[in-house]
């Protein structure tokens, strides 16, 4: 979660929560008493924005959280890594029936970055997002937090980009980072033929058939 | 419910050690961090530091480095706090309080039990 | 280590009044900051979470509000029992510092 953000090669990011400066300003639903903007501190004292929403209380929560408008440059399949805290309802007294300990994770395609509103029914399901019994333990500045990582991929997709949401049922959740990205295959070279960079298939199975040149003093 | 049940009143000697504690029922004691604040008379409260509950380890704000140890009897869902070499200065109210050990966002992130506090008096 | 200084030291009310206390962070606490309430002789109790959140059971005529590194408890139209002593604190980085108090008498 912290330091320097170093990812693979084969990984190109669109979106990096942690690396955004200034708040993220993402949109919320309702705009007041569901998902919220709040700030922690990372060891390196520098604020980590997150995402946080705990109406284990009151029951219907249905709280929605839409990110900016991501590009997909080309992609077909983009990957989502979200890595957040989710309360265990056992911990929290008087909440049985109302607290929930899932969210769901939805994406809408579309060639308008500016869209300005939720609008819910235009937004596909990828996956109900849950705790995995397996955490990181992290210390982030002056605190502990059981970090749980999931990664969902969504495709083939056809527009210029796409919105996430998150929508929350009445769960006690943080949501420390939220990561998108593509793969591609890295610059290759097969017996003096060089193959560019290219972005991997709508499926993680697919073939991508790509035209390679000859390397510097070569020939076909 | 939930409370966090302090020692009694001690009147010590300067140079003399104190050991005060803190016991907590109505929760899970190893699901809340354990926290110690300073308030001398007449003065404002002074956070002293705090202690994990799960691994025992301290922490320690500058001022109450050296003389001052935090520990704990998890069996008995209990912290103490130990004085060691007192002084004039530690003549003051102490009081444990509990946050989460881990944190699951600001709704849960604040002192919400504490200690009604125990008075050490060091007089000669 | 951050600072938090709060103001005023004291006051000095008549009840229904409104009063407002603030407190100074010596650098941006991104809204991390709880107040409480201490009656003499007694331990602090919660009155605001998270800068502007109401703890359970805390009258509404509290509230809490700011950001960055200013930040102000207003209490409207005050009680006999609203009288005593109120401190900010920070949770931004340890060591968690409290304001140095202000002490709300009756006129």
């Known amino acids: 979660v912290t330091g320097s953000r170093v990812y693979p090669a084969n990984e190109v990011t669109l979106l990096d929560s942690r690396s955004v400066q200034g708040e993220l300003g993402w949109i919320a639903s309702p705009l007041e008493g569901g998902w919220e903007e709040v700030s922690i501190m990372d060891e390196k004292n520098t604020p980590i924005r997150t995402y946080q929403v705990c109406n284990v209380m009151e029951p219907s929560q249905n709280n929605w959280l839409r990110t900016d408008w991501i590009t997909r440059e080309g992609a077909q399949r983009v990957y989502i890594e979200i890595k957040f805290t989710l309360r265990d309802c056992n911990s929290l007294p008087g909440v049985m029936g109302t607290c929930k300990e899932t969210f769901n994770l939805y994406y809408y395609e579309s060639d308008n970055d500016k869209e300005r509103f939720i609008r819910e029914n235009q937004f596909v399901k990828i996956d109900t997002i849950a705790a995995d019994e397996s955490f990181t333990q992290v210390d982030i500045g002056d605190r502990i937090m059981k970090l749980n990582t999931e990664i969902r991929d969504v495709g083939p997709l056809s527009k210029k980009g796409f919105y996430l949401a998150f929508q929350d049922v009445g769960a006690c959740i943080a949501l420390v980072s939220v990561r998108v990205f593509y793969k591609k295959c890295p610059l290759t070279v097969r017996n003096l033929a060089q193959f560019p960079d290219t972005i991997t298939g709508a499926d993680t199975s697919s073939l991508v058939e790509v035209r390679g040149s000859c390397v510097n003093n070569s020939e076909e | 419910q939930i409370q966090l049940v302090q020692s009694g009143p001690e009147l010590k000697k300067p140079g003399e050690t104190v050991k005060i504690s803190c016991k907590a029922s109505?929760?899970?004691?190893?699901?809340?961090?354990m926290h110690w604040v300073k308030q001398a008379p007449g003065k404002g409260l002074k956070w002293m530091g705090w202690?994990?509950?799960?691994?025992?380890?301290?922490t320690y704000a500058d001022d109450f480095k050296g003389r001052f140890a935090f520990s704990l009897e998890t069996s008995a869902s209990t912290a103490y706090l130990q004085i060691n070499n007192l002084k004039n200065e530690d003549t003051a109210t102490y009081f444990c309080?509990?946050?989460?050990?881990?944190?699951?966002?600001?709704?849960?992130?604040?002192?919400?039990?504490w200690g009604a506090g125990t008075t050490v008096t060091v007089s000669s | 280590d951050i600072q938090m200084t709060q103001s005023p030291a004291s006051l000095s009310v008549s009840v229904g009044e409104t009063v407002t206390i603030t407190c100074r962070a010596s650098?941006?606490?991104?809204?991390?900051l709880a107040w409480y309430q201490q009656k003499q002789g007694k331990s602090p109790q919660l009155l605001v979470y998270?800068?502007?959140n109401l703890a359970d059971g805390v009258p509404s005529r509290f509230s809490g509000s700011g950001s960055g590194t200013q930040y102000s408890l207003k209490i409207n139209s005050l009680q006999s029992e609203d009288f005593g002593s109120y401190y900010c604190?920070?949770?931004?980085?340890?060591?968690?510092?409290f304001g140095g108090g202000t002490k709300l008498e009756i006129k």
């Open positions: 650098e941006n606490i991104y809204r991390n």
């Open positions: 309080a509990r946050i989460p050990l881990y944190y699951y966002g600001s709704r849960y992130w604040y002192f919400d039990v």
């Open positions: 604190q920070h949770f931004w980085g340890t060591p968690w510092t």
């Open positions: 202690i994990n509950t799960e691994t025992g380890e301290p």
């Open positions: 998270a800068a502007t």
């Open positions: 109505g929760y899970t004691f190893t699901d809340y961090s």
